[in-house]
């Protein structure tokens, strides 16, 4: 019998590299059975995950999986960091693994990129 628990399919140590000034959609794949849970995004600040309020979010349905999307319109340098989605299901909170957004600022010709940026 298939489990009807809510599952959040963000892979451990997943990351995204994107330019500041580019659009980006951060997706949280959500599996549920009957009723879609309430899902939120938060950004890690040390050990605390701060809930993101007033941000553009949306749902996308694909076959047997739904995606809760956090829209970056566009990505800002300050968006660099780790994010987590969490679902409220039957009064329980299910948390995803964190996913990291590496924001690269477009360089001017006189600036040199860091080794991390060149490799990321």
């Amino acid at each position: 019998k298939e489990s009807c628990d809510v599952q959040l399919y963000i892979k451990r140590q997943s990351y995204h590299s994107i330019f500041a000034g580019d659009p980006f959609k951060l997706e949280c794949p959500v599996k549920y059975c009957a009723h879609r849970p309430q899902v939120t995004w938060c950004k890690l600040n040390g050990t605390t995950c701060v809930k993101l309020e007033g941000r553009h979010t949306s749902w996308k349905q694909e076959k047997n999986l739904s995606f809760f999307i956090l829209h970056f319109e566009p990505v800002l340098p300050s968006d660099n960091g780790s994010y987590r989605c969490s679902a409220n299901f039957l009064s329980a909170i299910i948390e995803s693994h964190s996913t990291t957004l590496y924001v690269t600022d477009v360089k001017s010709a006189s600036e040199r990129p860091s080794k991390d940026e060149m490799a990321s």
Epitope: H16, S17, I18, F19, A20, G21, D22, P23, F24, E73, P74, T104, V106, K107, S108, A109, S110, E111, R112, P113, E117, M118, A119, S120
Partner: antibody, heavy 115, light 114 residues
Framework: EVQLVESGGGLVQPGGSLRLSCAAS????????IQWVRQAPGKGLEWVGF???????YYASRAKGRFTISRDDSKNSLYLQMNSLKTEDTAVYYC?????????WGQGTLVTVSS | DIQMTQSPSSLSASVGDRVTITCQAS??????LSWYQQKPGKAPKLLIY???TLASGVPSRFSGSGSGTDFTFTISSLQPEDIATYYC????????????????FGGGTKVEIK
Amino acid sequence: EVQLVESGGGLVQPGGSLRLSCAASGFDISKYNIQWVRQAPGKGLEWVGFINYGGSAYYASRAKGRFTISRDDSKNSLYLQMNSLKTEDTAVYYCARGLSNSDLWGQGTLVTVSS
Amino acid sequence: DIQMTQSPSSLSASVGDRVTITCQASQSISSWLSWYQQKPGKAPKLLIYRASTLASGVPSRFSGSGSGTDFTFTISSLQPEDIATYYCQSTYGGVVGSTSDDNPFGGGTKVEIK
């Protein structure tokens, strides 16, 4: 509706100038990286340059010194000023939102450089 | 200067076939590569960015892989609507802060139905 619309194309003589516009609707163009890409008739895509969200412009060597990308935030528009035009600049010119994740493109405007 | 070499320049395949296109950079561009689809008379459409990230709304039959200098774009099961020209583009210039004397786009691959 979120879209980009290019305009200003047309027929111009070699050595002449033309200013293309890229008008944005549904989003604030000043917050985004915007690139210009062109395509000569029957040929592949060719990068012209881009302006980043901070307002710094970057150009391909073939455009450097002849082309200038600028932005008018009050009109939510971007411009490509093209001077000293050559016959090889004949192409459809596109503007696109984003540099790596270029999710939105205009329909293009045709520039013909001919005597 | 980074040069992008795309191959083949054209290919013919049957509906349902697996189609593979390659793009080679003349020097390492990490994963800063995008793939586009363009149909006649239309603007390019982003399919893949950062070498392997599927753009929003793009069917899962499209995929990309690779890093450094060698990249691959795959259509797992060719559909009639996939008839188009496909282009790779290096966006590494945004990282290193220089523009190339060469075009960061590959030469394109025209995909036709057999």
